[in-house]
């Protein structure tokens, strides 16, 4: 079972200095959205799948990996416009004749139902309601993901309240 990420509570001591180092927190970078144990960044521009992959790398992240139907639904709930779709980190491996995530794992048959062709140069994108395959050269928006990381934030004690 995955660990749940709740809100952090902090014991505030009686004697406080002006600035105190806050305990470890799970934080997403600015502009990234927290979705359970991940931080997601929805692009504002469009790119072919390979360029999208590269862009996520430059942000020290990866194209979105979806573990199960629940995560798919949670992500789709963040897509507020039915007329926009996003590349994810899944493409067709011709050598293995299977859908392959960019972390090297293969798509389980019950994970996602992909509408479209499973063939060379096919990559996967998600919309508000569906999952599709498309030519990887197609220019679309994309989603990068980061695992939530532990950071030490210096904060004013008053901001704890």
């Amino acid at each position: 079972q995955k660990p749940s990420i709740g809100k952090c509570s902090v014991d505030i001591q009686q004697n406080r200095t002006k600035t105190t180092e806050r305990p470890d927190l799970l934080n997403c970078p600015i502009y990234w959205q927290q979705v359970q144990e991940k931080c997601l960044l929805f692009s504002h521009t469009v790119n072919p799948w390979n360029n999208s992959l590269a862009d996520c790398s430059t942000k020290e992240s990866s194209l979105l990996l979806i573990q199960d139907k629940d995560e798919l639904t949670r992500t789709q709930n963040l897509i507020h416009d039915k007329a926009i779709s996003f590349w994810i980190g899944l493409n067709f491996s011709l050598s293995e004749k299977n859908w392959k995530w960019i972390n090297g794992s293969f798509l389980s048959s019950n994970d996602l139902k992909i509408t479209g062709d499973a063939k060379e140069n096919s990559c996967v994108y998600i919309s508000q309601t569906s999952v599709y395959s498309e030519y990887c050269s197609t220019e679309m928006k994309w989603i990068c993901q980061k695992e939530l990381t532990l950071v030490r934030n210096k904060v004013s004690p008053d901001s704890w309240l």
Partner: antibody
Framework: QVQLVESGGGLVQPGGSLRLSCAAS????????MSWIRQAPGKGLEWVSY????????AYADSVKGRFTISRDNAKNSLYLQMNSLRAEDTAVYYC???????????????WGRGTLVTVSS | DIQLTQSPSSVSASVGDRVTITCRAS??????LAWYQQKPGKAPKLLIY???VLQSGVPSRFSGSGSGTDFTLTISSLQPEDFATYYC??????????FGGGTKVEIK
């Protein structure tokens, strides 16, 4: 205001050339697949060509391949269609159209210009 | 090329009538089908895409259904502004994108 405005149509002799332009406004032009679609007088619709957001991918209907060239200038929010070796059967209203962003190269046209009439006649 | 055959080519109907237009593809196109409305002297307007998804701003009296080769556009209660010509369009990966011949909805 979100709109597309075509220009450049007119009367041209067979074998002649024309360049159509489409000015886009009110949306982020550089993110959309754009197409030209035509309609001969009293007839149905015919897709002519599309171009991807960056201009890297282009496709044409067989009827215009080798004669028409689609291009775009994202800095100017403009789409173009260079038409050479024009024939009588190219006579039509030419529409510039934007595609829905959600469906990749499955191009559904959600925004159209009013069209510009091209007449090819001697 | 994938051919789309619309029927009927024209239909006479009255305000309040239920109108059904069909579009048949020469080969299977999954759900890659759109419906457009065009009025004289105007550009077409997207009504339905992906066979059944209502485009934003389009009245709910319009609906689409079908998959594979047979598709239907239904206007549940015809309004005065609905008298127009309707076209289906297929958008599979097999170029060119093609349109049906059109169905003219006229006032009875």
């Amino acid at each position: 205001q979100v709109q597309l405005v075509e220009s450049g149509g007119g009367l041209v002799q067979p074998g002649g050339s024309l360049r159509l332009s489409c000015a886009a406004s009110g949306f982020t032009f550089s993110q959309y697949y754009m197409s030209w679609i035509r309609q001969a007088p009293g007839k149905g619709l015919e897709w002519v060509s599309y171009i991807s957001p960056s201009g890297a991918t282009i496709a044409y209907a067989d009827s215009v391949k080798g004669r028409f060239t689609i291009s775009r200038d994202n800095a100017k929010n403009s789409l173009y269609l260079q038409m050479n070796s024009l024939r009588a059967e190219d006579t039509a209203v030419y529409y510039c159209a934007r595609s829905l962003m959600s469906t990749g190269t499955h191009l559904y046209f959600d925004l159209w210009g009013r069209g510009t009439l091209v007449t090819v006649s001697s | 090329d994938i051919q789309l055959t619309q029927s009927p080519s024209s239909v006479s109907a009255s305000v309040g009538d239920r109108v059904t237009i069909t579009c048949r593809a020469s080969q299977g196109i999954s759900s890659w089908l759109a419906w457009y409305q065009q009025k004289p002297g105007k550009a077409p307007k997207l009504l339905i895409y992906a066979a059944s998804v209502l485009q934003s701003g389009v009245p709910s009296r319009f609906s689409g259904s079908g998959s594979g080769t047979d598709f239907t556009l239904t206007i549940s209660s015809l309004q005065p502004e609905d008298f127009a010509t309707y076209y289906c369009q297929q958008v599979t990966s097999f170029l060119p994108y093609t349109f049906g011949g059109g169905t003219k909805v006229e006032i009875k």
